[in-house]
């Protein structure tokens, strides 16, 4: 049967075996304090998973600057707000005399946490779009990109836990948090659902004194206590990579290839998102089909369904088709694709402001999922990005120039030297439920949602209303 024909650089059989068809995401944030280094990296995942890792590395310098100690997870990030808890300033060796330092952590009531969640979700949307535009500006034109705003926000928010003075204010601003957003940490913790596992861990050198208040706050809010590294770089490397592998379901087996001998602080945040399509795609219907890329047409593996449940509409502001596909665990994939080939993705990106995005998501909430003729490429996007340049693009320079982490450590000589963020997002066919062939009747007018040109995507948490992942696809083969 010619239906099986699949002409492309990969035959249909091999394409069908490329993954379970899950959407899984793992984000690792790594922050090392050695020489001014802050690395945030999300490592690639295996088939049908999404991983993001963020690593921040810091080291001691002669400058009295401290470095952020959290690592951005690869999930939607929030805009500057203050940590839910404040760290005490009881240490006798405050880096800066008379300066503000986070006070003791105060836990929030359920009522406070609940009201904070809406603010946090809103902030995460704003932060996600800030990040999207920053990532886009740093990337080559017409290239794929993926990141986890939530991962990055988680890392920066954990840094916020120990930030003082300007660093605190600047972080709040970047994250779009209101000033003194004291419940943010607990709210952030509440944003984890069954489909998303978020874990944090701090590793530090034996000679670095971490404040008890920060240790306690981390334990309470991020469910981890700082672990002491040894004086053996190789052993430390193994310890960190083992932790990462364990906490990303082995999707990221090696976050670090090397560890500087003068590493003093490593902050990791791993987010593993494992979600499947609510409705399975039939792998037999995945074929090599045309996709408009730049000024040509390429062949890519396309998933097809005649009656896939999609909520969709045309947005006139963006001149885009907007479609939402259900995933498990109250998550969904939202796709924004230019209405036709006359409209470019770049133009759509530029028009995508927080207010436009929020209006689209509100409209999607009101839209019904209807059986739709759907054509969607298999997606695998891998992105590695230096986050220091992203932070500077967002006009946050503290990691390089004037970092104040007085609430984290008494040591005034920390500076972020590297921050790397890496994400792999892969979407294949498998879902939780089989397509209900007889359960849905096709409307008299056939509803169509075909995605055969570059598009923007958002992995959306429908309960808390924030982006877990965001990105764009220019070339689904990449």
């Amino acid at each position: 049967n010619p239906n099986a024909t699949s002409s492309s650089s990969q035959d249909p059989e091999s394409l069908q075996d490329r993954g379970e068809g899950k959407v899984a995401t793992t984000v690792i944030s790594k922050m090392l304090f050695v020489e001014p280094i802050l690395e945030v990296s999300s490592l690639p995942t295996t088939n049908s998973t999404t991983n993001s890792a963020t690593k921040i590395t810091a080291n001691t310098t002669d400058e009295p600057t401290t470095q952020p100690t959290t690592e951005p997870t690869t999930q939607p990030t929030i805009q500057p707000t203050q940590p839910t808890t404040q760290l005490p300033t009881d240490s006798p060796t405050q880096p800066t005399t008379g300066s503000f330092c986070p006070g003791p952590v105060t836990l929030c009531s359920d009522l406070e946490s609940h009201s904070t969640e809406a603010v946090l979700g809103d902030a995460l949307v704003d932060f996600s779009l800030k990040l999207y535009h920053a990532f886009s500006a740093m990337k080559k034109v017409e290239t794929n990109m993926a990141f986890s705003p939530f991962s990055i926000a988680s890392l920066l928010t954990q840094v916020l836990l120990g930030a003082g003075e300007n660093t605190k204010t600047n972080l709040e601003s970047i994250l779009s948090y209101p000033k003194d957003f004291t419940c943010v940490h607990q709210a952030l913790k509440g944003f984890t659902t069954k489909g998303v596992t978020s874990v944090s861990q701090i590793f530090h050198s034996p000679d670095l004194a971490i404040r008890d208040t920060f240790v306690n706050a981390s334990r309470t809010l991020y469910s981890s206590s700082p672990r002491v590294l040894s004086n053996n770089s190789d052993a430390n490397l193994e310890l960190i990579n083992t932790w990462v592998a364990k906490n990303t379901n082995n999707k990221i087996s090696r976050l670090l290839d090397s560890l500087p001998s003068d590493t003093r602080l490593v902050l990791l945040n791993a987010i593993y998102l494992s979600a499947k399509w609510k409705t399975t795609f039939d792998p037999k219907k995945t074929r090599m089909e045309p996709f408009h890329f730049k000024n040509s047409v390429i062949k890519v593996p396309m998933m097809n369904s005649k009656k896939y449940p999609v909520a969709h509409f045309i947005d006139q502001t963006l001149k885009a088709k907007v479609g939402q596909l259900q995933l498990s665990h109250n998550l969904s994939l939202v796709i924004l694709v230019p209405q036709n080939l006359k409209h470019r993705l770049e133009d759509m990106e530029q028009a995508l402001s927080p207010s436009v995005f929020k209006a689209i998501m509100e409209k999607l909430e009101m839209s019904k999922f209807q059986p739709t003729l759907l054509t969607l490429p298999r997606i695998k996007v891998t992105t590695s990005q230096d986050m220091l340049s992203i932070m500077e693009k967002l006009e946050f320079f503290d990691f390089s120039y004037d970092l104040n982490l007085c609430g984290l450590t008494e040591d005034p000589d920390l500076q972020v030297s590297a921050m790397q963020h890496q994400t792999v997002l892969e979407l294949t066919e498998t879902g939780v439920e089989a397509a209900a062939a007889s359960a849905i009747s096709v409307a008299r007018t056939l509803l169509v949602f075909e995605v055969q040109q570059p598009f923007l995507f958002v992995l959306w948490d429908q309960q808390h209303k924030f982006p877990v992942f965001m990105g764009r696809v220019y070339d689904p083969r990449a």
Epitope: S7, K299, V448
Partner: antibody
Amino acid sequence: EVQLLESGGGLVQPGGSLRLSCAASGFTFSDYYMSWIRQAPGKGLEWVSGISRGGEYTFYVDSVKGRFTISRDNSKNTLYLQMNSLRAEDTAVYYCARDPGGLDAFDIWGQGTLVTVSS
Amino acid sequence: QSVLTQPPSASGTPGQRVTISCTGSSSNIGARYDVQWYQQLPGTAPKLLIYGNSNRPSGVPDRFSGSKSGTSASLAISGLRSEDEADYYCASWDDSLSGPVFGGGTKLTVL
């Protein structure tokens, strides 16, 4: 029986227009890409244009871009080719073809309709 | 000139085995794209003979077989019959041209 039936061909002057139609029957039309393929007298086959299942995406050979427009009406099981600014080199038998994959294997063909561009 | 190169003609006697070649490049067959073969009997529309390099649609006799290697493909017809006299076209996707392309065709004569 699976069938494709073209119509609309004829004699037209250079610069003129024609609209070809292709009526499909015997299968679920919206399950397939559709294409137009032409064959000049005594010559080989040339793919001209294709359209996605839902009709949202269209594809053309360079020589007809901007002059020809492919479209489909899934409710009527019909494929169209609007041909404008016709040239002598467009003279050919135009076949409508069903395409189960994505513009590569044409498993069912119509009988063809002749388009002659001449003054 | 066609992107896919076929010999203009081929011939054989009844019962013989005949092979028709189709040579492409790294932007089509060499890019691991599938090759299709079509048969066009005199005065009729083309018919799909082989798809996906070597698969036969139902109704096509197993005397027809296809294969592909590198940037070339070939169609083999064994037990040649008079009714096999026709034009044969290979086809594939071409990245450079962003679309499907056909070979120039091979006229098979059964002597």
